[in-house]
C-alpha cells in the first residue's frame, strides 16, 4: 500500500508559530511499541501455493539496517500434486515502508526519512486476460 | 518481517563526540525516494485464491496518517470452481513498519518513531498438522 506525499505540512509547526530553523526538526530517541512482533504462521514462504525466497539487504547507515525482500519462486502456483500450475500466477505483495537514513560529517549527525518498497511475500491469483489487437 | 531493537546505538553520535542534548536528534525535513510507488498487479486482493479486504486507519498525528490493514476473507482458499477449499488455509502476511508520531504542546513540536504491525495481504498455505494428545 502506498504512503502519501508529505507535502511537508505534517512536519511544519502551526502557522502562528515561528518556523523550524534550518529545515530540520526534533526527533526523540527511542521507538514507541518497539517490542511489538510479527506473529505469522511458521514457514509460510515454503508452505504457500505461491512460495517465495528471502534476500536480506544490509546498510549500517539505515534503520532498520536489515531490510528483507521476498521474491516469488515461480510464475505459476503449486497445485495439490506439488506441480506448478501455470494457469494461475504467483504475484508479489508489495508495501511502502519508512526507514531512517543516517548522515554524518564528523560529529554532526542528522537523520532523514526514506521511503523503501518492500516485497513482503507472494499470493496466487487468477491472471487478468488482455485481448491484444 | 521484523525490525530489530534499536539498542539506540544507531541514533547515538560516535563515542568521541559530545552526547546528543536532551535525548533528541536532528531530523531533516523531506523524504528520500518520496515518489517511489508500489507497482502491484491490479486487484490482487480479489483475484487471489486467499482473498482479503482492506481496512483504513486514520491518525492525523501519525505519518503516514493513513495505514491500511488487510484481513483474510476466508479460513480456506478459493479453488478453481470458486468454492472455498478448507483443506488449505488463507493466512495473513505481516510486516513490521515504521511510522512517525507527532507530539505537540503549543509551538513545541517533536517527533518520535513508532513501530506498527501491518497485515499486507494473504497467501494460501497447506496447514501444519499438530497431533494433540
Amino acid at each position: 500500500r502506498k504512503i502519501p506525499k508529505v507535502g511537508h505540512t505534517f512536519f511544519q509547526k502551526p502557522e502562528s508559530c515561528p518556523p523550524v530553523p534550518g529545515g530540520s526538526m526534533k526527533l526523540d530517541i527511542g521507538i514507541i511499541n518497539e517490542n511489538q512482533r510479527v506473529s505469522m504462521s511458521r514457514n509460510i514462504e515454503s508452505r504457500s501455493t505461491s512460495p517465495w525466497n528471502y534476500t536480506v539487504t544490509w546498510d549500517p547507515n539505515r534503520y532498520p539496517s536489515e531490510v528483507v525482500q521476498a521474491q516469488c519462486r515461480n510464475l505459476g502456483c503449486i497445485n495439490a500434486q506439488g506441480k506448478e500450475d501455470i494457469s494461475m500466477n504467483s504475484v508479489p505483495i508489495q508495501q511502502e515502508t519508512l526507514v531512517v537514513r543516517r548522515k554524518h560529517q564528523g560529529c554532526s549527525v542528522s537523520f532523514q526519512l526514506e521511503k523503501v518498497l518492500v516485497t513482503v511475500g507472494c499470493t496466487c491469483v487468477t491472471p487478468v486476460i488482455h485481448h491484444v489487437q | 518481517r521484523k525490525i530489530p531493537k534499536v539498542g539506540h546505538t544507531f541514533f547515538q553520535k560516535p563515542e568521541s563526540c559530545p552526547p546528543v542534548p536532551g535525548g533528541s536528534m536532528k531530523l531533516d525535513i523531506g523524504i528520500i525516494n518520496e515518489n517511489q510507488r508500489v507497482s502491484m498487479s491490479r486487484n490482487i486482493e480479489s483475484r487471489s485464491t486467499s482473498p482479503w479486504n482492506y481496512t483504513v486507519t486514520w491518525d492525523p498525528n501519525r505519518y503516514p496518517s493513513e495505514v491500511v490493514q488487510a484481513q483474510c476473507r476466508n479460513l480456506g482458499c478459493i479453488n478453481a470452481q470458486g468454492k472455498e477449499d478448507i483443506s488449505m488455509n488463507s493466512v495473513p502476511i505481516q510486516q513490521e513498519t515504521l511510522v512517525v508520531r507527532r507530539k505537540h504542546q503549543g509551538c513545541s513540536v517533536s517527533f518520535q518513531l513508532e513501530k506498527v504491525l501491518v497485515t499486507v495481504g494473504c497467501t494460501c498455505v497447506t496447514p501444519v498438522i499438530h497431533h494433540v494428545q
Epitope: - | L75, I86, N89, P127, I129, V132
Partner: nanobody, 116 residues
C-alpha cells in the same frame, strides 16, 4: 495451547447410525473451524466434514453428503457428527480437528467400523 477431547465411534452394521462428539479448549480465533478427518491405513487422510466456528458454514466430502450432519454447540465449543446410513467404506479412524489459519490440530482418533 489447544486441547481436543473426542468420544463416540465403535462397531455398527451397514445402514446403521453412530454419533461422534468432540470438544475443543484453548486459544480459538474468530477465523477457525472444527470438524473431522478420517484415515484408512495406507490411504490418504480425507476431510469428512467441517463447521466454521463463527460463520456456521458447513463443508462435507461428496462421499458423505446427505448421510452425515455436523453441528456445533457454541457455548462449550463442542461439535457432533451424526452419521446415518453407514457403509463399509466409511470404516476408518476418525480424527476430530480444530483448524486455526495455517495450523490443523488433530485429536487422538476414534475407530469406526461398519460391518456388512
Amino acid at each position: 495451547q489447544v486441547q481436543l477431547v473426542q468420544s463416540g465411534g465403535g462397531l455398527v452394521q451397514t445402514g446403521g447410525s453412530l454419533r461422534l462428539s468432540c470438544s475443543v479448549s484453548g486459544d480459538i480465533s474468530s477465523q477457525s473451524a472444527m470438524g473431522w478427518y478420517r484415515q484408512v491405513p495406507g490411504r490418504q487422510r480425507e476431510l469428512v466434514a467441517m463447521i466454521h466456528t463463527t460463520k456456521g458454514d458447513t463443508y462435507y466430502a461428496d462421499s458423505v453428503k446427505d448421510r452425515f450432519t455436523i453441528s456445533r454447540i457454541n457455548a462449550n465449543n463442542t461439535i457432533h457428527l451424526q452419521m446415518n446410513n453407514l457403509k463399509p467404506e466409511d470404516t476408518a479412524i476418525y480424527y476430530c480437528t480444530h483448524n486455526e489459519p495455517g495450523d490443523l490440530y488433530m485429536g487422538q482418533g476414534t475407530q469406526v467400523t461398519v460391518s456388512s
